[in-house]
């Protein structure tokens, strides 16, 4: 039978060394014995590459291509294939699809003062343009009251956040998780990093008095 | 050490045919991209055809599209230009040189880094 | 198609001296930052051409720091300070950005 592309493949990069993209088929797939996505930079001299697609669900294909670090003028030329057959071609330019990696290594000291120190790792090393064009949004929750959650906005540069003791309930188990995003590239946000949990140890001052 | 060593070059008539060789060695030849360059007689140097390192993507001068054509064997880390109809202002040294690394993604520039000694083309009646 | 001009067409420069030739592209040749896809060569009488500078001001595998190289965008310049005789020859710029590739029409540099 004819095989049709239900959803155009969209396509996200990391700006460092992955570009992933994900299209959804007219049925289920076997997203690696059907189907090629080849990927050619629009530069002189450039080769054609081949990614071979991964199923994510029954008919949705997925395929992460290894690109150079990222700049501002790449323009790489896709073309979907299905043995012969030419399903889709399109476009695609990394620096206008930006999805950040996610940041790594999420954890909560105590600090002086009644205070939680949040900590994470940029997932950028230092010469990359986006580590310094990163801001994170970061999101503590109860695990027992869905509705006790708060969200924070880092904007400056250090990848911490100091959080209050009081403001959260005493004796509570809560959870953070933390994503980023760049503003300059209109990223989308990055996938939210692994949840961390701690215990609110703090005693509100009525019950010192 | 890297060579390039061009032969093929010979006195032809206008409208005939010649095939140029480039023989490479010291290096990964099927990585880079080979380039042709020629230069008539007391002119300046101008650029005639790129070839990939695969093979699968070739360009050309305006001057030549259509009758030359660059092709290359990996295997025996040879480059060739094959000239068509041949006219008096193909009259020239033609040399190869080594451009661009290919293999990677964004192919890796380096100018053309190294030159052939040329081999001399003469279209005459 | 993009278009090179060099300027001047022939220098005559005493040993010691420096030496400069400019190089003008019709479009700008950065592709990204620090990334201009600009080359110098240099063809000695009777010889090949040689490899001097690329990507702009970077230097070739055992070209002598004299030579140097600077500009970004569509203008450039080859600087040969501390003139030897050997230098003689003809000076070509080449851009390497996009098909058809080209070249400045040459700079003839003679020794005094």
């Known amino acids: 039978g004819s095989v049709k592309v239900l959803h155009e493949p969209s396509c996200f990069s990391d700006y460092i060394s992955t570009s992933v993209c994900q299209w959804k088929m007219d049925h289920p797939t076997n997203c690696s014995a059907e189907l090629r996505l080849s990927y050619q930079l629009d530069f002189m001299g450039s080769e054609n590459h081949t990614c071979v697609p991964e199923n994510r669900e029954d008919s949705v294909c997925v395929c992460s291509m290894p690109i150079d670090d990222a700049v501002e003028a790449d323009v790489y030329q896709l073309d979907l294939w299905a043995g012969q057959q030419l399903l889709w071609s399109g476009s695609f330019q990394p620096s206008k699809h930006v999805k950040p990696r996610t940041p790594g290594n999420l954890t909560v000291h105590p600090n002086i003062s009644h205070t939680w120190l949040l900590m994470w790792t940029n997932p950028y090393p230092t010469e990359n343009h986006l580590h310094s064009e990163l801001t994170y949004m970061v999101n503590v929750s109860n695990d027992n009251d869905p509705e006790d959650f708060k969200v924070y906005n880092v904007t400056y540069m250090g990848p911490t956040l100091r959080l209050a003791a009081s403001t959260l309930k005493s004796g509570a188990s809560y959870s953070a998780r933390v994503r980023a995003w760049a503003q300059t590239y209109n990223s989308t946000w990055s996938d939210w990093s692994p949840s961390t949990t701690w215990l609110n140890y703090y005693e509100p001052w009525e019950q010192h008095l | 050490e890297v060579q390039l060593v061009e032969s093929g070059g010979d006195l032809v008539k206008p409208g005939g045919s010649l095939r140029l060789s480039c023989v490479a060695s010291g290096f990964t030849f099927r990585d880079y991209a080979m380039t042709w360059v020629r230069q008539a007689p007391g002119k300046g140097l101008q650029w005639v055809s790129l070839i990939s390192g695969s093979g699968g993507k070739t360009y050309y001068a305006d001057a030549v599209k259509g009758r030359f054509t660059i092709s290359r064997d990996n295997a025996k880390n040879t480059l060739y230009l094959q000239m068509n109809s041949l006219r008096a202002e193909d009259t020239a040294v033609y040399y190869c040189?080594?451009?661009?690394?290919?293999?990677?993604?964004?192919?890796?520039?380096?100018?053309?880094?190294?030159w052939g000694q040329g081999t001399l083309v003469t279209v005459s009646s | 198609d993009i278009v090179m001009t060099q300027t001047p067409l022939s220098l005559s420069v005493s040993p010691g001296e420096t030496a400069s030739i400019s190089c003008r592209s019709s479009?700008?040749?950065?592709?990204?930052?620090?990334?201009?896809?600009l080359d110098w060569y240099l063809q000695k009488p009777g010889q090949s051409p040689q490899g001097l500078i690329y990507?702009?001001?970077k230097r070739a595998s055992g070209v002598p720091d004299r030579f140097s190289g600077s500009g970004s965008g569509t203008d450039f310049t080859l600087r040969i300070s501390r003139v030897e005789a050997n230098d003689t020859g003809v000076y070509y710029c080449m851009q390497g950005l996009q098909s058809p590739l080209s070249f400045g029409q040459g700079t003839k540099l003679e020794i005094k």
């Open positions: 040189a080594v451009d661009r690394l290919t293999k990677t993604i964004r192919p890796q520039y380096y100018g053309l880094w190294h």
């Open positions: 990507l702009g001001s």
């Open positions: 479009q700008s040749l950065l592709y990204s930052i620090g990334y201009n896809y």
